[in-house]
């Protein structure tokens, strides 16, 4: 069948019909429904929500909706033995204790099963010792502490402020520095925007608010006990000592009221510069230990959380494609939340729900997409992207052969300033073209396109007249699809003004105060930004599933490959003498990029000219486009990170949230001047250049004429 036979709505009308069916009021209603009680992964409440979503997706008209369950390692506080931190005096008496829970927001005082703030997967322990303040606990912060300030964290409890990097990286860095415990806190400098009131009177973090979150270093492994394979009924599970990515020292999060009590007594070295000072009225001394009068006092952690194998449930909905049912476009976002999930994830889940409803409406009118669309409500994202990863592990053979694209749908908003998109370069043109067709919801841009407001507010640093599109990193459910399987991926949400708001994420992230009211009162009362995000996410899915020729432009990959090659070369050229000594050359990489550019250009010309009515040739060309992302996968993975297999992009080794380009070369060059064996270190740089050059060349050849 041709694609026109797959529908009784004219092709031009298809997208408009789909977009017109999306309603802000429905998203609002769904968000309310999803946020009235907590939906923590592994709980009965979240299982019930999975069944509700399954039922509603069936009602909306999907062909099938199934639950996919897995038994994975999760982590919970001990209900009878709470976690807390103390200041103890020389006699061991607790003279100060941190709070055991967040004061509940108005209207939620009687809600049960609000999990108290904890760091998921922290081991149990009661370490006591002197405190060292380590700023954000980034790699560079520990370099400054150890190299410039000569502060040894070995045997110390470190206190780090949230922000800048993924919390798991903070814990890993602290472990490597020899710390015996980690306290994480939210500093007002990062989580309290000036001129805004704290919740419930505004969207800022109150002093008793605390950010929950997992502290794993999974590097894409999924369930810590079954890396590489699904955690199904017959799974072989590793012992806890062999589990992937678990922290080895106790970790606990606190709010800034409690942090003040710990930090105000700090002695030792002054902060190295003002970037180490937050907004509390404390000196931000680094330590170790407390100042003069309090020098005999210590800090003690009391952590009693347990790791438990627990059942989780994904909801997988299918809308079968009429022409190419064996080609999958996936829209997925998670359902589990730390507490109410007002923003994370339910502002995303509500958008997915409305997108499913709109697609279902079209299907009931007789329309089908050209390709199959899979919709997913993932479980246990907050515990390490577990639901999505286990499902992808279980279905990896299908996905690597049939996966066209994955669009992620976590939080729809983290602000209300402008659009934010991270995606594969293959999707740049799709995103540009789509946003040019959508109306901007922004004040002052009435009657203007989304592309125009987005470009004005978030301009590309390289290309004038174009918006910024960022690299994919990780920290969300696209990870397994993109970084492991090489399926073209993208994500979109509304964000804050990064120029004026320097706080990390949004202030109430992962706190009890992330409620429906937070969104409805302060972020998006008209749900117009949610609707825009629904249009972007849904529009991308629609085009990916329905375009006769896949809306991928391989020339955009050529452009970024050159940019990334230039960038990594300039990093290496900071060591000109060593490059000469060890004969380090980037010629092979630049040559491969040049070849890729030429072949991509020729492929694009053929794409314009070929006979689209010939289904075999059409399928062949589309397969070359689909498999291009796959061609950047190295089956051996990156060094020490076997599940990060994409050679062009990986999550930064220093911040899971950030994407790094040519990560193999980047990591080989990182801090190379401090390596004990320079010959070996530069040898690894050369090997990584070789791997990158080969991969780019091999990917280019997949775009060559097949015979």
């Amino acid at each position: 069948k041709s694609s026109n036979e797959a529908t009784n709505i004219t092709p031009k009308h298809n997208m408009k019909a789909f977009l017109d069916e999306l309603k802000a009021e429905n998203i609002k209603k769904f968000l309310y429904n999803f946020t009235q009680i907590p939906h923590l992964a592994g709980t009965e409440q979240n299982f019930q929500l999975a069944k509700q979503i399954q039922s509603q997706w069936k009602e909306f008209g999907l062909d099938s909706v199934e639950l996919a369950h897995y038994d994975v390692l999760l982590s919970y506080p001990n209900k009878t033995h709470p976690n807390y931190i103390s200041i103890i005096n020389e006699d061991g008496n607790e003279i100060f204790n941190t709070s055991l829970f967040e004061p509940p927001p108005p209207g939620y005082e009687n809600v049960s099963d609000i999990v108290p703030p904890f760091s998921a997967f922290s081991p149990q322990g009661m370490p006591e010792g002197d405190l060292v303040y380590v700023n954000y606990a980034r790699t560079e912060d520990f370099f400054k502490l150890e190299r410039d300030m000569k502060i040894n964290c070995s045997g110390k409890i470190v206190i780090a402020r949230y922000g800048k990097v993924f919390r798991g990286n903070k814990v890993k860095n602290a472990q490597l520095a020899g710390a015996k415990g980690v306290i994480l806190y939210s500093d007002p400098a990062d989580y309290f925007a000036p001129g805004v009131k704290s919740y419930p009177d505004g969207w800022n973090l109150p002093g008793g608010g605390v950010q929950r979150g997992n502290i794993l270093n999974l590097n894409g492994a999924g369930d810590p006990l079954t890396p590489g394979y699904p955690a199904n009924e017959y799974a072989y599970r590793r012992g806890i000592a062999e589990a992937v990515g678990l922290p080895s020292i106790p970790v606990h999060p606190i709010g800034y009221y409690d942090a003040q009590k710990l930090l105000e007594k700090m002695g030792g070295s002054a902060p190295p510069d003002s970037s180490w000072r937050g907004s509390l009225k404390v000196p931000y001394n680094v330590g170790p230990g407390f100042t003069g009068n309090f020098s005999t006092q210590k800090v003690k952690m009391h952590i009693h959380s347990t790791n438990e194998v627990t059942r989780i449930y994904n909801v997988i909905g299918t809308l079968r494609g009429a022409v190419e049912p064996d080609r999958y476009v996936i829209l997925g976002g998670h359902r589990d939340s730390w507490v109410f999930g007002g923003i994370d994830p339910q502002s995303g889940a509500a958008v997915v729900h409305e997108i499913v409803r709109s697609f279902g409406t079209l299907k009931k009118e007789g329309w089908r997409p050209r390709r199959t669309i899979l919709f997913a409500s993932w479980d246990a994202e907050e515990f390490g992207l577990l639901g999505s990863t286990e499902w992808a592990e279980e279905n990896s053979r299908l996905l690597q052969e049939r996966g066209v694209a994955y669009i992620n749908a976590d939080s729809s908003i983290e602000g209300n300033y402008t659009l934010r998109v991270d995606c594969t370069p293959l999707m740049y043109s799709l995103v540009h073209n789509l946003t040019k067709e959508l109306k901007s919801p922004d004040e002052g841009f009435e009657g203007k396109s989304l592309y125009e407001s987005w470009t004005k507010k978030s301009p590309s640093p390289e290309f004038s007249g174009m918006p910024r599109i960022s690299k994919l990193g990780s920290g969300n459910d696209f990870e397994v699809f993109f970084q492991r399987l090489g399926i073209a991926s993208g994500r979109a949400r509304y964000t804050k003004n990064w120029e004026t708001n320097k706080f990390s994420g949004y202030p109430l992230y992962h706190s009890v105060y992330e409620t429906y009211e937070l969104v409805e009162k302060f972020y998006d009362p008209m749900f117009k930004y949610h609707l825009t995000v629904a249009q972007v996410r849904g529009g991308m899915v629609f085009e990916l599933a329905n375009s006769i020729v896949l809306p991928f432009d391989c020339r955009d990959y050529a452009v970024v490959l050159r940019k990334y090659a230039d960038k990594i070369y300039s990093i290496s050229m900071k060591h000109p003498q060593e490059m000469k000594t060890y004969s380090v050359s980037f010629d092979s990489l630049f040559s491969a990029v040049k070849n890729f550019t030429e072949i991509a250009s020729k492929f694009s010309e053929r794409l314009q000219d070929f006979d689209k009515s010939n289904p075999i040739v059409l399928r062949m060309m589309n397969d070359q486009l689909m498999f291009l992302e796959r061609a950047f996968i190295d089956p051996l993975g990156l060094p020490d990170r076997p599940f990060y297999r994409h050679v062009i992009y990986a999550p930064s080794s220093h911040n899971k949230y950030a994407g790094e380009s040519f990560p193999g070369i980047y990591d080989a060059l990182f801090d190379i001047e401090s390596k004990v064996d320079p010959s070996k270190a530069w040898g690894e740089v050369k090997r990584q250049i070789y791997v990158a050059a080969f991969t780019v060349q091999a990917a280019a050849e997949t775009l060559s004429e097949v015979a």
């Epitope: 410039d148 300030m149 000569k150 070295s269 002054a270 190295p272 510069d273």
Partner: antibody
Framework: EVQLVQSGAEVKKPGESLKISCKGS????????IGWVRQMPGKGLEWMGI????????RYSPSFQGQVTISADKSISTAYLQWSSLKASDTAMYYC??????????????WGQGTLVTVSS | QSVLTQPPSVSGAPGQRVTISCTGS?????????VHWYQQLPGTAPKLLIY???NRPSGVPDRFSGSKSGTSASLAITGLQAEDEADYYC???????????FGTGTKVTVL
């Protein structure tokens, strides 16, 4: 009492080598950075470089990199500043100074009395 | 050549207030590094006067005070006394040089 005692004045000819010293006492010598500062006749202070005797980590001002060598012998709590080939323009008063703590970014709270180096043919 | 600029000289009558400015850049004072001040009496080694922008070591009279804003810092001497006649130097870490820099120095004269 915390103090830094520097070696005596030196008169040298151009091309000669020289090593001046700075002995610390009254504190844990290995736990504090020691910096060197030059003051040419009638001129201001110039930061030359710094050493952490605990691990011999040494940092130089770009202006002095390759011109002088800073070292320390922790067994005798002494820091050194040396030249392999003096020039007339090296004529100056040289001060050693201890940082206030183990941090490179701390101020210098204890200073030596200075060593006058005169280079003349 | 110093990257911290001070006025070559300031003067004041006994009892007066004088201030010395220290202007840096985005790689030193403006980067958030602390500013320290030293006093050098004629023929002696420098002495720490102010550390961490505004802190006085014990023994330094409270007539001396320091402040910092943006890419500049200043030292104020109130109730100027004859024994304050000396050279004064500011100091800050500079990230572009990976080391410390001193100011050009200011001679304070008590009239």
């Amino acid at each position: 009492e915390v103090q830094l005692v520097q070696s005596g004045a030196e008169v040298k000819k151009p091309g000669e080598s020289l090593k001046i010293s700075c002995k610390g006492s009254g504190y844990s010598f290995t736990s504090y950075w020691i910096g060197w500062v030059r003051q040419m006749p009638g001129k201001g202070l110039e930061w030359m470089g710094i050493i952490y005797p605990g691990d011999s980590d040494t940092r130089y001002s770009p202006s002095f990199q390759g011109q002088v060598t800073i070292s320390a012998d922790k067994s005798i709590s002494t820091a050194y500043l040396q030249w392999s080939s003096l020039k007339a323009s090296d004529t100056a008063m040289y001060y050693c100074a201890r940082s206030m703590g183990s941090s490179l970014y701390a101020s210098s709270d204890v200073w030596g009395q200075g060593t006058l180096v005169t280079v003349s043919s | 050549q110093s990257v911290l600029t001070q006025p070559p000289s300031v003067s004041g009558a006994p009892g007066q207030r004088v201030t010395i400015s220290c202007t840096g850049s985005s790689s030193n004072i403006g980067a958030g590094y602390d500013v320290h001040w030293y006093q050098q009496l004629p023929g002696t080694a420098p002495k720490l006067l102010i550390y961490g922008n505004s802190n006085r070591p014990s023994g330094v009279p409270d007539r001396f005070s320091g402040s910092k804003s943006g890419t500049s810092a200043s030292l104020a001497i109130t109730g100027l006394q004859a024994e304050d006649e000396a050279d004064y130097y500011c100091q800050s870490y500079d990230s572009s040089l990976s080391g410390y820099v001193f100011g050009t120095g200011t001679k304070v004269t008590v009239l």
